[in-house]
Interface confidence: medium
């Protein structure tokens, strides 16, 4: 059920997945919606507690039943992820936040005219996730007009504090406004030897690229295909970064593919959702439910309609013993990161992903021709 | 259960695995945490006994129940390993110990300005594990400013004595501060013919390399793969060293792989923990428990959550018709050195390691680009 209403002075009890810091309840809901498992959130508004270090905390929550008990809490704002909702969702957040300092790794500072120009700098820098700009009213004269570009491991600030004379905001890459080069090539027989920031399991290089695009710090990736010689690394998608933003070393290796995040692109293809079916493929993960349905499309629909389902494996009916009505068995699954824990072949399954992320693809997806 | 508290004037009774010498209770706990089986320790502080040769003894202990009886002992400090704890653990120890002489094989001496420079020399020498530096206050004028580089078979001093005018400490290689060449290549079809200091069983060359990296004196290794002609040597990981620090002879042999310890590297990959699953592979060892679980991920999690479990083999349930809950059987295992005693194939098991050592990977693992 889709619940768009937020509940003021209410906290959801239990179900904590993690805590991040966001400048508003709206942005907290956006983070929850994009998180692989978050279904509910509680946001601690400014002055919600005597301890300012707890202000702006966005507590991401999950529940097997998709609901949690509500308790009264002054200054808390609680609500539900938009995973359960049909509407188109944008990952783009153009809001700026006055008198808020969003803390992160300050890796670049420069003097610019205004906050808009600072946001543009952030949008046009490969590493930048958010920024803080010291306005002409900032108390320290030496720091006025200073634009700080920032990133964190998670893509959200490590903390947020009140600070007069500053304006903060997020990169507009996901609004399709980056002028950085969009590199769509996928390079066959290529391993990129830079820093692995994360690794996930993926069925193909296109899913790996989408995961990289959706990841806060991934700039490029290497994917090891099913034919990769080292069995334990098959289907491994290595999410990578480097200081320069470009890979430093390219190694030629068969059965590996590499490419770049599409975060700078005006998307002509889906970058969040993975619509394909993968034949003779089992996605392993945490089993959520097993239902009998007719056909893999229905299985995918069932997964999409279940807010906690991330991916599925469907076994067509001929695999069942005393098969009656040509229904197959649909295994609904999830994992901590939204990706299968393992991918197996030769067991007769047909696997795929929930389509609930499709509605997060930016509006350009259906408007811009591929180059 | 994680217990961070230490117990003063208390000794744990029984469960002894081995005794090493460490300059502090903190370092004793570090050694216990890294030891494959140690769960508890008792450290004999200075003046803990009338016999100075017993001072600084660090007694590593194990217990099937994970607890041991406590007895009063003046000067003893007892506590628990951090294996049971969730926090990130560093193998890096920057402390220096004033007026303590840490004994070992003195293989190099030179005159340097201060203790920091001596520690840097140690960090930038392949063999050096710890050092003793004679300060300007050392009684013997001839030996002042002398920096002694040391190693032992275990990586810890053979004994520790009180000695005025000296400062001792450990190499900072595990802090990612070594300037020595980091050699990441793994060489196929290669046997290195130098001194074997130890041998363990490993599923692949990457695990072999991690074990070498974690070993106090291993500088390089040779691994015999599953296809190695001599059956008794298959999956054998030979840990090696040489006087020069580099291999002297390289022999071309099919189905063998060789490489180097990553102790000098600023790690971009885990070097302590072995996260992969090994399909159609049985790890043999001492059985700790057998539990029915859903999936190899749960089996690995069960192993990780058991402080004594080092590795496991999981046998999936077959896709039977009237199968109810798709549980497989999870065998939790351990051995004296943390590695399987044998590795077998073709029996349908899925094997892997406890992930508890992952938290020992140094912080650089996720932060520093590979050199």
């Amino acid at each position: 059920e889709c619940v768009t209403k937020v509940f003021k002075d209410i906290s959801f009890q239990g179900g904590d997945l993690s805590t991040v810091f966001t400048p508003s309840a709206t942005y907290c809901r956006l983070v929850c919606t994009h998180h692989p498992r978050c279904l509910l959130f509680t946001f601690m508004a400014e002055s919600s507690s005597d301890d300012p270090t707890k202000w702006f905390a966005c507590i991401l929550k999950d529940s097997v039943t998709e609901i949690l008990p509500m308790v009264n809490m002054t200054g808390a704002i609680s609500g539900y992820s938009f995973k359960q909702c049909p509407q188109q969702l944008s990952t783009c957040s153009k809001d700026v936040y006055v008198n808020l300092d969003m803390k992160g790794m300050n890796y670049n500072s420069s003097v610019v005219k205004n906050a808009r120009e600072c946001q543009e700098r952030c949008t046009d820098d490969a590493h930048c996730q958010f920024f803080t700009y010291a306005t002409g009213y900032f108390p320290s004269v030496d720091h006025r007009k200073m634009c700080l570009l920032k990133y964190t491991r998670t893509g959200t600030p490590t903390t947020i504090t009140k600070l007069n004379g500053v304006v903060s905001g997020f990169s507009l890459k996901s609004c399709g406004l980056s002028n950085l080069a969009c590199i769509r090539d996928i390079f066959p027989n290529t391993v990129l030897a830079d820093l692995n920031i994360d690794s996930v399991v993926a069925p193909d290089a296109f899913v790996c690229r989408r995961i990289c695009t959706h990841h806060p710090t991934c700039l490029f990736f290497t994917f090891f295909s099913q034919a990769w010689p080292k069995e334990s690394q098959r289907h491994l998608c290595l999410l990578k970064t480097s200081e320069s933003g470009l890979p430093s070393t390219r190694i030629t290796k068969s059965h590996a593919l590499s490419g770049f995040s599409l975060q700078h692109c005006r998307h002509s293809v889906p970058v969040f959702c993975h619509p394909s079916f993968y034949n003779d493929t089992d996605f392993l993960g945490e089993e959520l439910d097993i239902v009998d349905v007719k056909g893999q499309e229905t299985c995918q629909k069932t997964c999409t309609n279940n807010a906690r389902c991330q991916f599925f494996t469907y076994y067509p009916s001929h695999r069942l013993c005393n098969e009656r009505n040509r229904r197959g068995r649909c295994y609904l699954k999830l994992s901590s990161n939204g990706s299968p824990t393992r991918i197996l072949h030769g067991r007769g399954g047909i696997s795929g992903y929930s389509l609930r992320l499709c509605k997060m693809d930016n509006v350009c997806t259906t408007k811009i021709n591929p180059r | 259960e994680c217990v961070t508290k230490v117990f003063k004037d208390i000794s744990f009774q029984g469960g002894d695995l081995s005794t090493v010498f460490t300059p502090s209770a903190t370092y004793c706990r570090l050694v216990c945490t890294h030891h494959p089986r140690c769960l508890l320790f008792t450290f004999m502080a200075e003046s803990s006994s009338d016999d100075p040769t017993k001072w600084f003894a660090c007694i590593l202990k194990d217990s099937v129940t994970e607890i041991l009886p406590m007895v009063n002992m003046t000067g003893a400090i007892s506590g628990y390993s951090f294996k049971q704890c969730p926090q990130q653990l560093s193998t890096c120890s920057k402390d220096v110990y004033v007026n303590l002489d840490m004994k070992g094989m003195n293989y190099n001496s030179s005159v340097v300005k201060n203790a920091r420079e001596c520690q840097e020399r140690c960090t930038d020498d392949a063999h050096c594990q710890f050092f003793t530096y004679a300060t300007g206050y050392f009684p013997s004028v001839d030996h002042r400013k002398m920096c002694l580089l040391k190693y032992t078979r275990t990586g810890t001093p053979t004994t520790i004595t009180k000695l005025n005018g000296v400062v001792s400490g450990f190499s900072l290689k595990s802090c990612g501060l070594s300037n020595l060449a980091c050699i990441r290549d793994i060489f196929p079809n290669t046997v290195l013919a130098d001194l074997n200091i130890d041998s363990v069983v490993a599923p692949d060359a990457f695990v072999c390399r991690r074990i070498c990296t974690h070993h106090p004196t291993c500088l390089f290794f040779t691994f015999f793969s599953q296809a190695w002609p001599k059956e008794s040597q298959r999956h054998l990981c030979l840990l090696k060293t040489s006087e020069s620090g580099l291999p002297s002879t390289r022999i071309t042999k099919s189905h063998a792989l060789s490489g180097f310890s990553l102790q000098h590297c600023r790690h971009s990959v885990p070097v302590f923990c072995h996260p992969s699953f090994y399909n159609d592979t049985d790890f043999l060892g001492e059985e700790l428990d057998i539990v029915d679980v859903k999936g190899q991920e749960t089996c690995q999690k069960t192993c990780t959550n058991n402080a004594r479990c080092q590795f496991f083999t999981y046998y999936p349930s077959h896709r039977l018709c009237n199968e109810r809950n798709r549980r497989g059987r999870c065998y939790l295992k351990l051995s004296s050195n943390g590695s399987p005693t044998r590795i077998l194939h073709g029996r349908g098991g899925i094997s892997g390691y406890s992930l508890r050592l992952c938290k020992m990977d140094n912080v650089c693992t996720t932060k520093i680009n590979p050199r």
Epitope: A126, A181, D185, E243, R250 | -
Partner: nanobody
């Protein structure tokens, strides 16, 4: 020391063609952004075409799309600009430039190494 040396400029009638070359030393084209920029008298330096040399990603200014083609020869460590259907407004000093890191492809501010330039003059 990085050195970029342009050649191939000259005078040509409108509608004609030229091929510019840029030879690099002290810098490898194998995995970087390299490009062509131009500056007409009294005007700002502007991006013409850029290539990401690991693959086939190319970026062109709207004014040259369909007429100019950028390419590279990694073996020779050389960058090229094939210019067809030249127009008088293409008259400018043409510079080869190389970057260090990710760039806005036609933004000269992001390029750190520059050649001395080669003059292209197109008469009507």
């Amino acid at each position: 020391q990085v050195q970029l040396q342009e050649s191939g400029g000259g005078s040509v009638q409108a509608g004609g063609s030229l091929r510019l070359s840029c030879a690099a030393s002290g810098y490898t084209f194998s995995n970087n952004f390299v490009g062509w920029f131009r500056q007409a008298p009294g005007k700002k330096r502007e991006g013409v075409a850029t290539i990401y040399t690991l693959g086939s990603s190319t970026y062109y200014a709207d004014s040259v799309k369909g007429r100019f083609t950028i390419s590279q020869d990694n073996a020779k460590n050389t960058l090229y600009l094939e210019m067809n259907s030249l127009k008088p407004e293409d008259t400018a000093m043409y510079y080869c430039a190389a970057a260090r890191g990710w760039v806005s492809p036609l933004d000269p501010a992001r390029f750190v190494y520059w050649g001395q330039g080669t003059q292209v003059t197109v008469s009507s």
